[in-house]
Interface confidence: low
């Protein structure tokens, strides 16, 4: 004799207000003899939803004819769904007894829920920029979804992140829920072009997860490296000195030249180029006049990047006798 199984195939049933919901329940055996009843909830406070033999259940109809002798389908339809109908529904087999029937076996239950889509995830990064090798936090929020079960994942450039903490509120029963997650991301020097993505999957989205993004360019500061060099050739009485400011982000940069401690006001030629990784290079050329009576010259290239403390590089100008005597023009 086959042991009776109560099959409720859906763990979750999404319903819409005003529509009809079908709750499936099939049994695998006709034995033991006795009725199948439907309840919402468990324990002594459970609510009777349908009893074929007695009671009045105007909104409930059966899918199959329960009077048929070999009927094994005890599925029901509940019409005109309202928010008050949400909960977990169980089909329960009773064994015929005297004076009362005895509960024999319950199905695993089907949760009936009013579905509500989560809002588009909003990702917020840190308030201030941080340099590479440091950790920054990003938060992701989505609201207004139901049922409570939801999955949230974080990605950086398509690679899943594991260092994050997620909370779904409220913890108890509610019409709608919110999710908030905070991910910790270690910045790499090449992250100017990187993105973090918060991805939310929910039953109402049916496999088309919602995504929120944030650009790491908003969170990262890549400090520049400086190099000051003297060009070997000169133009007439002038020597060309170059200050190369490499690999910085964001673009905001102030560069000043000083000659023996005195800030030079005159204009200098410069170029800005963008690297493949999104960082920038800045090159500034400074022409220094050289003459016989001139002492040694110390040039300083000072850079203030993105409101940070200034960094500088110095160069003691080497003016050889040969250079001083040379009168012909040379192109650098």
């Amino acid at each position: 004799e086959e042991e009776l199984q109560m099959i409720q195939p859906e763990k979750l049933l999404l319903v819409t207000v005003g529509k009809t919901a079908t709750l499936h329940c099939t049994v695998t055996s006709l034995l033991p003899v006795g009725p199948v009843l439907w309840f919402r909830g468990v324990g002594p406070g459970r609510e009777l939803i349908y009893n074929q033999k007695e009671g009045h259940f105007p909104r409930v109809t059966t899918v199959s004819d329960l009077t048929k002798r070999n009927n094994m389908d005890f599925s029901i339809r509940i019409s005109s769904i309202t928010p008050a109908d949400v909960g977990t529904y169980y089909c329960v087999k009773f064994r015929k007894g005297s004076p009362e029937n005895v509960e024999f076996k319950s199905g695993p239950g089907t949760e009936m829920a009013l579905g509500a889509k989560p809002s588009a995830p909003v990702v917020l990064g840190p308030a201030a920029r941080t340099t590479p090798e440091h950790t920054v936090s990003f938060t992701c929020e989505s609201h207004g979804f139901s049922p409570r079960d939801i999955t949230l994942k974080w990605f950086k450039n398509g690679n899943e992140l594991s260092d994050f903490q997620t909370n779904v509120d409220p913890t108890g029963q509610s019409v709608a829920y919110s999710i908030r997650s905070t991910a910790r991301v270690v910045l790499d020097p090449w992250d100017v072009r990187s993105q973090v993505i918060c991805e939310v999957a929910h039953v109402t989205l049916q496999g088309d997860p919602l995504r929120g993004t944030a650009n790491l360019s908003e969170a990262i500061r890549v400090p520049p490296t400086l190099e000051v060099t003297q060009q070997p050739m000169r133009v007439g009485n002038q020597v060309n000195v170059t200050c190369q400011v490499r690999k910085f982000y964001p673009q905001s940069l102030q560069l000043t030249w000083s000659e023996n401690g005195n800030v030079c006001q005159r204009e200098t030629a410069s170029t800005l180029t963008e690297n493949k990784d999104g960082t920038y290079n800045w090159t500034s050329w400074f022409l220094v006049n050289i003459s016989d009576q001139r002492d040694d010259v110390v040039l300083t290239c000072q850079v203030k990047h993105d409101g940070q403390l200034a960094v500088s590089k110095r160069l003691a100008l080497e003016v050889t006798v040969h250079q001083k005597d040379q009168s012909s023009d040379a192109t650098p």
């Epitope: 859906e10 999404l14 319903v15 579905g115 991805e199």
Partner: antibody, heavy 120, light 107 residues
Framework: QIQLVQSGPELKKPGETVNISCMAS????????MNWVKQAPGKGLKWMGW????????TYADDFKGRFAFSLETSASTAYLQINNLKNEDMATYFC?????????????WGQGTLVTVSA | DIVMTQSHKFMSTSVGDRVNITCKAS??????VAWYQLKPGQSPKLLIY???IRHTGVPDRFTGSGSGTDYTLTISSVQAEHLALYYC?????????FGGGTKLEIK
């Protein structure tokens, strides 16, 4: 068990309209999206788009915007594909495929396919 | 759109052989690749998803591998019933796209 049963083959003339149905059973219809996939003779599979069976929102791939329409009859657990103003290049087998709602937009459950023949 | 390229339209093999069916994505799809078997007159059958996870009930002679842009479906011991078309599909971003298919023929 989960089943997707599609309507039978169709023979149509260019310019006519065809309706293909996909009836689902064995699961809660409104819990899972329904995708449509085209296979033209001698060609590969092409995703046409999908319809959210809970909200009724359709999403169409770029090549299937305009003459193609996805719809639902939720009470009958049925999804529909309608192709208007049929052209010769619409001659193909059309599959419906159920969408899981996790992170795996691959398709474990398919209808048997509906062959649409377009001939003057 | 992400283009999935199956460079071999046909592959000929013998019963008992090991065969590798390859698929190349036009960009990194982070292992979001599925493989399907399609026999004449039937609907596609899901074999593999997430590049290497076997779908329920799929025999272990089917294995998937790969990362980045390059993916492979391996049939360790080909049987006559494996004569079919095999498609890869990316499930990384919409629109979901399939490869052109590889027809496995038995010598």
């Amino acid at each position: 068990q989960i089943q997707l049963v599609q309507s039978g083959p169709e023979l149509k003339k260019p310019g006519e309209t065809v309706n293909i149905s996909c009836m689902a059973s064995g699961y809660s219809f409104t819990n899972y999206g329904m995708n449509w996939v085209k296979q033209a003779p001698g060609k590969g599979l092409k995703w046409m788009g999908w319809i959210n069976t809970y909200t009724g929102e359709p999403t169409y791939a770029d090549d299937f915007k305009g003459r193609f329409a996805f719809s639902l009859e939720t009470s009958a657990s049925t999804a529909y594909l309608q192709i208007n103003n049929l052209k010769n290049e619409d001659m193909a087998t059309y599959f419906c495929a159920r969408q899981p709602y996790d992170y795996v937009p691959s398709f474990p459950y398919w209808g048997q396919g509906t062959l649409v023949t377009v001939s003057a | 759109d992400i283009v999935m390229t199956q460079s071999h339209k046909f592959m000929s093999t013998s019963v008992g052989d090991r065969v590798n069916i390859t698929c190349k994505a036009s960009q990194d799809v982070s292992t979001a690749v599925a493989w399907y078997q399609l026999k004449p007159g039937q609907s596609p059958k899901l074999l593999i998803y997430w590049a290497s996870i076997r779908h329920t009930g799929v025999p272990d002679r089917f294995t998937g591998s790969g990362s980045g842009t390059d993916y492979t479906l391996t049939i360790s011991s080909v049987q006559a019933e494996h004569l079919a078309l095999y498609y890869c599909q990316q499930h990384y971003s919409t629109p979901w796209t399939f490869g052109g298919g590889t027809k496995l023929e038995i010598k």
